[in-house]
């Protein structure tokens, strides 16, 4: 049940007052305001928007609003030397060139500073060679090519379709396979919904549309030149050769019209199966090289982008807590966009703006939250979560001691079908209870709760009558808070009915066609889905900041720990002989999970019964809840990924967007049958079980009675 705590205020200032103040019309107005020109990280336009937001948040009534700047490594195309890809004939003449820019959408023909499509942080280079089509360039796609089809990508330029996994993982896989260049393209099979027109007549990707994006493999490092520390005025910067996560081969994205011209000439091996075929009218031959008449033609990349240390600006707003000002609930989302940012990020930034306005309205009427709320407009998220990570690095000591929760607020919509939530298990009950109190915006669910429509449209695979809540992965600004610092985190947005394309994004993602009109005409004309997302995000922040007892249920962590232990055990049991040979046992992990379950249950009983009027005991119980997420942090981090320190969850090593449970054990077991030294490999599995079991047991003990 929602709290109605009075902190020197009249009782009307409760969650309902906060939610009733949120208005769809305001979100619409803010979205329009934020999307009229590009706001690329590191540009003057994005600095001006930061100052505008600072000014407006002050007007809305926050106690303080400051800009926090950092000088980080960014990447831009060369304005006078454009990037493109050619088909060259035997004489080296360019007989076909890919497009240099996306045809601008109607009404935006005269907008300046639209950055052409590029892969941020691609090195410069002009490699030429035969093409190999590598499907999605996933780990399993390269296994299929190299192991089953015996196709060698060494010295080849690979072409991969966007989708399924984070583009940085594709590039890393291509590098490891020996490729000398990567072409990324959007196949209509992944970015064109059947029966929908392409923009501007619908929300599908036109043939000239291209997805921008960074291709880093930062593994949580933040600025590539200052891993672990803020990129401030006195920072020591690594040389570019030692920078974290930079790709070593040229990479460039193209649209499907250009991809058609490259793929239609492909020869060599036929695709291994239908899962390698997209929707273009091409054979999807793997190669290497072109067929018959075109066998003497090659592909050449021309990449001239530059990496530059550039100033970025976060906006940090504070609404001081009345009772526990040293406890921070953070609502953050990014402000920088690739072009207009109609969905990513401004549909989220507009919601944050309205949430700030609502909180400000309550504050002006004399209300304060129990705990401090921090609002953040992050910069340079698109360049590797840089703004949020640098700020968290700068404030890590405060955050690890005072951070209660982080709620992320990037794109509010990626569809208009149902709610999508990814969060720590500690927040499951908060999300369930909140969505039961909110009205569903969905057609056919008038008068029904959001919980009901969400559960109907996206049911939990495990528990009937409950909605699906996913694991946190990465690819957004919660990463440093959750994966590095162990602060309970969550995110919510409206999504599509398109489970198979979970990690491919919506069709116009990161293209020039992601405009205000896209949202207003096709996704959410009434802005009712935006309002619902504002209510969910804002409601979570309100409850986290204002409830007397933190709305965390540690028993839900116990349930998932058992599920994750079962899952990793079953993966290991695919190798029964080796488990026997190397004496691999999961007993310690299951024992720790059992202990956690029992201790969490007893803690929950005490939580019901303790004297909430005793501020010392209240603070003690809340601290145990707040620090539970922190207890899953291993200070040494995961193998080769020192900034991923959460033992229960990490971004998948094969897809940054996806969350993996017990990632240390999972990675140790992955492809273990191919390891050259099985004894060493199984030894690492045993070590990871030990780390996981210890961590779960240690976390359980933080919930025990203190004395």
């Amino acid at each position: 049940k929602s709290s109605n705590e009075a902190t020197n205020i009249t009782p009307k200032h409760n969650m309902k007052a906060f939610l009733d103040e949120l208005k769809a019309e305001n979100i619409k107005k803010f979205l329009y305001n934020f999307t009229q020109i590009p706001h690329l990280a590191g540009t003057e336009q994005n600095f001006q928007l930061a100052k505008q937001i600072q000014s407006q948040w002050k007007e809305f009534g926050l106690d303080s609003v400051e800009l926090a700047h950092y000088d980080v490594l960014l990447s831009y195309p060369n304005k006078t030397h454009p990037n493109y890809i050619s088909i060259i004939n035997e004489d080296g003449n360019e007989i076909f060139n890919t497009s240099l820019f996306e045809p601008p959408p109607p009404g935006y023909e005269n907008v300046s500073d639209i950055v052409p499509p590029f892969s941020a942080f691609s090195p410069q280079g002009m490699p030429e060679g035969d093409l190999v089509y590598v499907n999605y360039a996933r780990t399993e796609d390269f296994f299929k090519l190299e192991r089953d089809m015996k196709i060698n990508c060494s010295g080849k330029i690979v072409i991969a379709r966007y989708g399924k996994v984070f583009r940085g993982n594709k590039v890393k896989n291509a590098q490891l396979a020996g490729a000398k260049g990567v072409i990324l393209y959007s196949d209509p099979a992944d970015y064109f919904a059947p029966g929908v027109k392409s923009y501007p007549d619908g929300w599908n990707l036109p043939g000239g549309g291209v997805q921008r994006g960074n291709i880093l493999n930062l593994n949580g490092a933040g600025d590539p030149l200052t891993p672990g520390y803020p990129a401030n005025e006195y920072a020591y910067r690594r040389g570019i050769a030692e920078a974290v996560g930079l790709p070593s081969i040229p990479v460039h994205p193209i649209g499907y019209y250009d991809a058609q011209k490259l793929l239609e000439k492909m020869g060599g091996s036929a695709p291994p199966d239908s899962s390698w075929r997209g929707s273009l009218k091409v054979p999807y031959n793997v190669g290497p090289g072109f067929t018959g008449n075109f066998s003497t033609q090659k592909v050449k990349m021309h990449i001239h982008s530059t990496n530059e240390v550039t100033r970025i600006y976060n906006v940090i707003g504070t609404l001081r807590g009345a009772v526990e000002p040293d406890r921070y609930v953070i609502l953050g989302g990014h402000r920088d966009s690739w072009v207009f940012g109609g969905i990513d990020p401004q549909s989220g930034a507009a919601v944050v703006h309205e949430i700030v306005r609502s909180f400000g309205t309550l504050k002006k009427e004399g209300w304060r939250p129990r705990r401090t709320i921090l609002f953040a407009s992050w910069d340079a998220e698109e360049f590797g979560l840089l703004g949020s990570t640098e700020w968290a690095e700068e404030n890590s000591r405060l955050l690890q001691e005072r951070g209660v929760a982080y709620i992320n607020a990037d794109s509010s919509i990626e569809g208009n079908y149902t709610l999508r939530v990814d969060c720590t298990p500690l927040m499951y009950s908060l999300v369930h209870n909140l969505t039961k109190e909110l009205k569903s915006p969905d057609e056919g669910f008038e008068g029904k709760s959001l919980y009901e429509s969400w559960t109907k449209k996206s049911p939990s695979p495990e528990f009937s009558g409950m909605p699906r809540i996913s694991k946190l992965g990465s690819g957004n600004d919660f990463e440093v808070f959750f994966q590095r610092l162990g602060i309970a985190s969550g995110r919510a947005r409206y999504t599509k009915n398109w489970e198979t394309n979970k990690f491919s994004g919506y069709p116009l993602y990161h293209s020039v066609y992601e405009t205000y009109e896209l949202v207003e005409k096709f996704y959410d004309p009434m802005f009712k889905y935006h309002l619902t997302v504002a209510q969910v995000r804002g409601g979570m922040v309100f409850e986290l900041a204002n409830s007397i007892v933190l709305p965390f249920d540690c028993r839900d962590y116990a349930v998932v720990l058992r599920k994750y232990a079962d899952k990793i055990y079953s993966i290991s049991m695919k190798h029964p002989q080796e488990m026997k040979t190397y004496s691999v046992s999961f007993d310690s992990l299951f024992s720790a999970v059992k202990n956690f379950t029992e201790i969490a249950s007893k803690f929950s009983e005490r939580l019901q019964d303790f004297d909430k009027s005793n501020p010392i005991v209240l603070r003690m119980m809340n601290d145990q809840l707040m620090f539970l997420e922190r207890a899953f942090i291993d200070p040494l981090g995961l193998p080769d990924r020192p900034f991923y320190r959460h033992v229960i969850y990490a971004p998948s090593s094969h897809n940054k967007y996806a969350g993996e449970s017990f990632p240390g054990i999972y990675d140790a077991l992955f492809d273990i049958e191919s390891k050259v030294d099985p004894s060493k490999a199984w030894g690492e599995v045993k070590r990871q079980i030990y780390v996981a079991a210890f961590t779960v047991q240690a976390a359980a003990e933080t919930l025990s009675e203190v004395a």
């Epitope: 007989i95 076909f96 011209k261 075929r277 999807y284 075109f294």
Partner: antibody, heavy 120, light 112 residues
Framework: QVQLVQSGAEVKKPGASVKLSCKAS????????INWVRQTPEQGLEWMGG????????NYNENFKGRVTMTRDTSNSTAYMELSRLRSDDTAVYYC?????????????WGQGTTVTVSS | DVVMTQSPLSLPVTLGEPASISCRSS???????????LHWYQQKPGQSPRLLIY???NRFSGVPDRFSGSGSGTDFTLKISRVEAEDVGVYFC?????????FGQGTKLEIK
Amino acid sequence: QVQLVQSGAEVKKPGASVKLSCKASGYTFTYFDINWVRQTPEQGLEWMGGISPGDGNTNYNENFKGRVTMTRDTSNSTAYMELSRLRSDDTAVYYCARDGNFPYYAMDSWGQGTTVTVSS
Amino acid sequence: DVVMTQSPLSLPVTLGEPASISCRSSQSLVYSNGNTYLHWYQQKPGQSPRLLIYKVSNRFSGVPDRFSGSGSGTDFTLKISRVEAEDVGVYFCSQSTHVPYTFGQGTKLEIK
């Protein structure tokens, strides 16, 4: 809007050549192949071949190979089709048509047609 | 070459009544990506052909919903639910799965 404007009617003697033009507007010329299709009362619609304006790659119907040449000028978004060694049965209406690319892969826009008469 | 055979070649229809045209191909028109590139064109008297239906059953933009396409493999049908006066003309099926692209002989729709 997409438009294909063809050159005017031609009268040719047998054995001569004819070169027809097709000027495209309203879209990015290099993205879409241009097909040439002819129509006669006897044979109906007959696909002669196509050209990719982006790289100049051509694909000819075997029935016309050796007699047909397709070219393009990207600077003025114009495709050309030359048919040589004309015979009386080449008398037809010749259409250029844009190959619609994904999702159509059909001829989604046609020129107005050029009548070619081959007569001694 | 793929031979496209239409029937009937002439189709007299009463206004407001349905009409159906059949098209058969000499080989399967399923492309390796699973799509079937069978299209229907309409040619009104004195005009160029225009695309009506693409990939068996998808209406091209601006085409009234009384036109529908169906079929698979080698057998395809174009249906007009209620014929209107403006529908008079010749209807061609065509395939672009195999090179050379080929057309049916055409079906002349006229009003009774």
